[in-house]
Interface confidence: medium
C-alpha cells in the first residue's frame, strides 16, 4: 500500500517538474489563446493586434482575420481568439468548407449549371432555390397511377393503382383517423352518398330509356364506351433545359 502511494507521489513530482522545465525552456507555451509569443520583446505574451487572432495557446504569430467582402457577409465577427465567419448575401448560398465560396440561388423549377440557372428537364423537378432537379416519382414502380402530373417545380402525385380507378371508384383521400367501433359519421355519409348515387343512376337511365332524341343517345353511348384514361405527364417547354449539355452538366438528365 505504502509502495503504491510512493509511486503516485513520485509520478506527480516528475510531471510537475517536467511542466516547470518545459515552461522554463519554452516560455511561449504559457501564452494563452488571443496572444502571441513576441520574440522582439523577450518572448513575452503580447495580445494579438487588431484584425488578427490566435485560437490556440503558445503561438508565435497571430493569424489575420478573414474579411467578408463582396458577395460574402459577416456571420460572426472576428475576435482575438477566433476567426470571422462569413455567409452569403441574399440570392446566394454557401459552398465548400467554411463557406469558401458563394453560389447563386436559382428559382424553383431550376438548377444551377456551369452556364447559370437552367430549367429542370422534362421528367425532373426542383421545389427549392438550391440543389438539383430530382426525377419525378415513378408511380408504376409501386403499382400506382399518376393522379397529378409533375411539373418543373413539383413532383407527380401518385394515386391508387389503375385497377382501383374504375369509373365508379371514389377519389383518393388520406386515411381517416382511427375511431371507436360504432356507426361513425363517415359510414353514414358513405351510405347516404351510395343511395343517392343509385337513385340518380336509376333516374338517369329511365330518362334515357324514354328519350326520343337519337343524336343525344348516340353521344351518351360514346361517353360510356370511352375507356378510362389515366392522366399523362404533359410535355413541358424544354427551352434552356439543364439536360442539353450532358458532358458539361455532370451527366445531364439521363434518367
Amino acid at each position: 500500500m505504502g509502495n503504491s502511494c510512493y509511486n503516485i507521489v513520485a509520478t506527480l513530482l516528475l510531471v510537475l517538474n517536467f511542466e516547470r522545465t518545459r515552461s522554463l525552456q519554452d516560455p511561449c507555451s504559457n501564452c494563452p489563446a488571443g496572444t502571441f509569443c513576441d520574440n522582439n520583446r523577450n518572448q513575452i505574451c503580447s495580445p494579438c493586434p487588431p484584425n488578427s487572432f490566435s485560437s490556440a495557446g503558445g503561438q508565435r504569430t497571430c493569424d489575420i482575420c478573414r474579411q467578408c467582402k463582396g458577395v460574402f457577409r459577416t456571420r460572426k465577427e472576428c475576435s482575438s481568439t477566433s476567426n470571422a465567419e462569413c455567409d452569403c448575401t441574399p440570392g446566394f448560398h454557401c459552398l465548400g468548407a467554411g463557406c469558401s465560396m458563394c453560389e447563386q440561388d436559382c428559382k424553383q423549377g431550376q438548377e444551377l449549371t456551369k452556364k447559370g440557372c437552367k430549367d429542370c428537364c422534362f421528367g425532373t423537378f426542383n421545389d427549392q432555390k438550391r440543389g438539383i432537379c430530382r426525377p419525378w416519382t415513378n408511380c408504376s414502380l409501386d403499382g400506382k397511377s399518376v393522379l397529378v402530373n409533375g411539373t418543373k417545380e413539383r413532383d407527380v402525385v401518385c394515386g391508387p393503382s389503375p385497377a382501383d380507378l374504375s369509373p365508379g371508384a371514389s377519389s383518393v383521400t388520406p386515411p381517416a383517423p382511427a375511431r371507436e367501433p360504432g356507426h361513425s359519421p363517415q359510414i353514414i355519409s358513405f351510405f347516404l352518398a351510395l343511395t343517392s348515387t343509385a337513385l340518380l343512376f336509376l333516374l338517369f337511365f329511365l330518362t334515357l330509356r324514354f328519350s326520343v332524341v337519337k343524336r343525344g343517345r348516340k353521344k351518351l353511348l360514346y361517353i360510356f364506351k370511352q375507356p378510362f384514361m389515366r392522366p399523362v405527364q404533359t410535355t413541358q417547354e424544354e427551352d434552356g433545359c439543364s439536360c442539353r449539355f450532358p458532358e458539361e452538366e455532370e451527366g445531364g438528365c439521363e434518367l
Epitope: C94, G131, I132, R134, T137, N138, R154, G251, L255
Partner: antibody, heavy 119, light 111 residues
C-alpha cells in the same frame, strides 16, 4: 444551436408498432429534404426513405409497406411510423437533413434513437 | 437493383500513412456526381466529409479528398491523423425514385 433530436425509440415486441420523431431546433425543417437512416448493431448504414421539402415521399424498397414517413411543419418535426416490426428491424435510427448544396448528401444528423424488437 | 460496393472492408494503417478507399456503384449515380463520403466513430452519428464526389464539406480538413465520376469513386486521406481512425461510408444518390444507397463501410484501424 442547430440540431436534430430523435425520440420514441425503445423495446417493442415482434409484430408491434413504434413511432419515431425527429425534432429540429435552429432550422426550419420545411425547407429541407429530410431522411431516415438506420444502423443495426455492428452493421453498416441503411437508407429508409425521405420526405422532400414540398412533401414528396420516397422509400427504399426494404421499407415500402411497413414504414411511413410524415412531417408536421407547425411542430418542426419529421416522423417515422414503423408497423409489423421484426427482430431484424433492431437498430439505431437516425434522421438526417440534406446538405444545402446536394440533395443526396446528409450534413446534419441526429444522435440516433435505439429501437429493439424482441419478445 | 442498386449496388454500392466499398473496398477494402478494413485497413490497418499508421499515423502519417496515405489511405485510399474505393467505392463502385451499379448503376451510375445520378448526374454522375451524386456521391458522398461519411466518417463514423463508435457510438456517434455519421459525419459528412465529401459531397458531389469531390467537394469538401464545411470544417473538414484538407487531407481528405474525393474523386471519381459515374460508377467509380475514391476517398483519399493524404496523411492519416490519430482522430481519423474510424469507419468510412460512401453513399450514392440515384435517379430511380430518388433512392440513396450506402456502401458496406471501411474500418480504418491502427496498425
Amino acid at each position: 444551436e442547430v440540431q436534430l433530436v430523435e425520440s420514441g425509440g425503445g423495446l417493442v415486441q415482434p409484430g408491434g408498432s413504434l413511432r419515431l420523431s425527429c425534432t429540429a431546433s435552429g432550422i426550419d425543417l420545411s425547407a429541407y429534404h429530410m431522411s431516415w437512416v438506420r444502423q443495426a448493431p455492428g452493421k453498416g448504414l441503411e437508407y429508409i426513405g425521405m420526405i422532400g421539402s414540398s412533401g414528396t415521399i420516397h422509400y427504399a424498397n426494404s421499407a415500402k409497406g411497413r414504414f411511413t414517413i410524415s412531417k408536421d411543419n407547425t411542430k418542426n418535426t419529421v416522423d417515422l411510423q414503423m408497423n409489423s416490426l421484426r427482430a431484424e428491424d433492431t437498430a439505431v435510427y437516425y434522421c438526417a437533413r440534406d446538405s444545402y448544396n446536394s440533395d443526396y448528401a446528409f450534413n446534419l444528423w441526429g444522435q440516433g434513437t435505439l429501437v429493439t424488437v424482441s419478445s | 437493383d442498386i449496388q454500392m460496393t466499398q473496398s477494402p472492408s478494413s485497413v490497418s494503417a499508421s499515423v502519417g500513412d496515405r489511405v485510399t478507399i474505393t467505392c463502385q456503384s451499379s448503376p451510375s449515380v445520378y448526374k454522375n456526381n451524386q456521391l458522398a463520403w461519411y466518417q463514423q466513430k463508435p457510438g456517434k452519428a455519421p459525419k459528412l466529409l465529401i459531397y458531389l464526389a469531390s467537394t469538401l464539406a464545411s470544417g473538414v480538413p484538407s487531407r481528405f479528398s474525393g474523386s471519381g465520376s459515374g460508377t467509380d469513386f475514391t476517398l483519399t486521406i493524404s496523411s492519416l491523423q490519430p482522430e481519423d481512425f474510424a469507419t468510412y461510408y460512401c453513399a450514392g444518390g440515384y435517379s430511380s425514385s430518388s433512392d440513396t444507397a450506402f456502401g458496406g463501410g471501411t474500418k480504418v484501424e491502427i496498425k
